[in-house]
Interface confidence: low
Amino acid sequence: QRLSRAQQQLPLESLGWDIAELQLNHTGPQQDPRLYWQGGPALGRSFLRGPELDKGQLRIRRDGIYMVHIQVTLAICSSTSTSRHHHPTTLAVGICSPASRSISLLRLSFHQGCTIASQRLTPLARGDTLCTNLTGTLLPSRNTDETFFGVQWVRP
Amino acid sequence: QRLSRAQQQLPLESLGWDIAELQLNHTGPQQDPRLYWQGGPALGRSFLRGPELDKGQLRIRRDGIYMVHIQVTLAICSSTSTSRHHHPTTLAVGICSPASRSISLLRLSFHQGCTIASQRLTPLARGDTLCTNLTGTLLPSRNTDETFFGVQWVRP
Amino acid sequence: QRLSRAQQQLPLESLGWDIAELQLNHTGPQQDPRLYWQGGPALGRSFLRGPELDKGQLRIRRDGIYMVHIQVTLAICSSTSTSRHHHPTTLAVGICSPASRSISLLRLSFHQGCTIASQRLTPLARGDTLCTNLTGTLLPSRNTDETFFGVQWVRP
């Protein structure tokens, strides 16, 4: 897939530098498994440059292939607490809206660990909203070096 | 944040291709939790292109947002050895100098695992020195496919 | 390492946008530890743009430094199943051909976890074929959000 002649001649910025790194704001109410994120220099080292937040969920504003990465650390955790339940605590990153594009992109279980971290390349489209669902009764750490979520546009 | 007119007109290289992938050289003396890194083609597949090493610690030479990634594997490890202590073995990546910018960027505990791996996007400035602190008595593997640390400049 | 004058003047695409994200197709026969991958829009969110597949193994078509990432989740897994064996289930990503360049790039053991995920920067050359070897008796999940493998060209 080659860049169009127009793309080749546009300034570099038009190719997309969209990037975001978010920190945990809070968890959802009882029946809402979503993590709610926040970003901005006033909060520390988090930022949004292109993507935006919609009620704590990350919305994409430029089509392209993105590197999506996440780390979530459980706040009050021992190796036994994560393996105590029949259904282990699980983190899933997915497109949650528009509904027509709803899909799970990345899924990890904690098993006997207290931190999960992963990353993947995935095509995303303008308007896609990414949700991060943490199922189970364990709470995530809000420490900015332990729990974070980000995306980086890497190519059209 | 848009690229300046000057940046748009400069050759691509001036936007920053700074990148490094390092392998473990050695651990610090008794009271020094830092890991000491090395890089260069003569050592294998590690390299430094832009950033530099200062006494085994990685120093940034170009402002920008970086993808920082790390994997550390404990050398002599079983799932029980990593959970033996009240304070589990922990790996933290942070800016350790200049002191005014000292902050923890990334933190993981081994719990019942023997490898941690993660990555994150973070703004770094010229002169920032990154330190990787491994607390606990367990030693890291020096195998180049098990323990490595790298940064990649991704945008201004 | 600076870009050549010719590279500076070529359209952006010529610098390399090679990228791939693959999903698991199947495991190898009894004595073959390799995982076999597949990619393409018809299969879901996997794709190949530059690299190619050769009998389920990923072949690089452009020299450069690549970010290689992988996540593998074991299909039928508990924390006891992964720690039962003297030699734990291990995942290794390496260059398997040409033979002269054969090397392990990335290695992780599952220990008491059921998912491994990591990433690293590494120089790759045109013609390098990457193999992902899963040793042990446990089978990987074929869910596309649990097991995936990708590469991204990041600089010459």
Epitope: - | T73, A75, I76, S81, H85, E146 | -
Partner: antibody, heavy 122, light 112 residues
Framework: QVQLVESGGGVVQPGRSLRLSCAAS????????IHWVRQAPGKGLEWVAV????????YYADSVKGRFTISRDNSKNTLYLQMNSLRAEDTAVYYC???????????????WGQGTLVTVSS | DIVMTQSPLSLPVTPGEPASISCRSS???????????LDWYLQKPGQSPQFLIY???YRASGVPDRFSGSGSGTDFTLRISRVEAEDVGVYYC?????????FGPGTKVDIK
């Protein structure tokens, strides 16, 4: 400071049983693996057994396997060695030693007790 | 089981002079992770053993830097750069690669 104090030694007839104790103080006992090591009079050291911090794993020397049982009570900060079917060759000073945490198989005995003498004789 | 041997079994030394003790194992103690599973202990007369070296070459906390460990695979050496009177006693190596752990027979170091 870290202290390990063995007790329970004495003279016992062959075929009989004895239980040794090792009382720990000065550190968080439940965080560490502990070993038993013995030394016959005028002889060298012989590793006997190890127990993990939480009692989940136990390993024994072939010479005592099936006869000796290592156990611990973390609530009492105490390690035990139950010795059954004692033989003359079990005569030794028995030391408990804390594992320093340097390896998955618990090598590195960084603190030792003073030892307790067990004499198996008719 | 892995068998450990030491030589010499007795080593008369002169204070201020160097000394070295050899330890051999019946199979390699080098793990695939690059570390050798061999420790050294010193038992001074009338005392419990004390920890000197772990993983072949790493000094335990508080051990003077005149003690050093080296070697790999099956052949290991404990060196004392300048012997002091307080260094007398029996030196033991132990393999911790696999259970059962096994000690060497010991090397008795005393002053000439």
């Amino acid at each position: 400071q870290v202290q390990l104090v063995e007790s329970g030694g004495g003279v016992v007839q062959p075929g009989r049983s004895l239980r040794l104790s090792c009382a720990a103080s000065g550190f968080t006992f439940s965080n560490y693996g502990i070993h038993w090591v013995r030394q016959a009079p005028g002889k060298g050291l012989e590793w006997v057994a190890v127990i993990w911090y939480d009692g989940s794993n136990k390993y024994y020397a072939d010479s005592v396997k099936g006869r000796f049982t290592i156990s611990r009570d973390n609530s009492k900060n105490t390690l035990y060695l139950q010795m059954n079917s004692l033989r003359a060759e079990d005569t030794a000073v028995y030391y408990c030693a804390r594992d320093g945490g340097y390896s998955g198989y618990d090598s590195g005995f960084d603190y030792w007790g003073q030892g307790t003498l067990v004499t198996v004789s008719s | 089981d892995i068998v450990m041997t030491q030589s010499p079994l007795s080593l008369p030394v002169t204070p201020g002079e160097p000394a070295s003790i050899s330890c051999r194992s019946s199979q390699s103690l080098l793990n695939s992770n690059g570390y050798n599973y061999l420790d050294w202990y010193l038992q001074k007369p009338g005392q419990s053993p004390q920890f000197l070296i772990y993983l072949g070459s790493y000094r335990a906390s508080g051990v003077p830097d005149r003690f050093s460990g080296s070697g790999s695979g099956t052949d290991f050496t404990l060196r004392i750069s300048r012997v002091e009177a307080e260094d007398v006693g029996v030196y033991y190596c132990i393999q911790t690669l696999q259970t059962p752990f096994t000690f060497g027979p010991g090397t008795k170091v005393d002053i000439k």
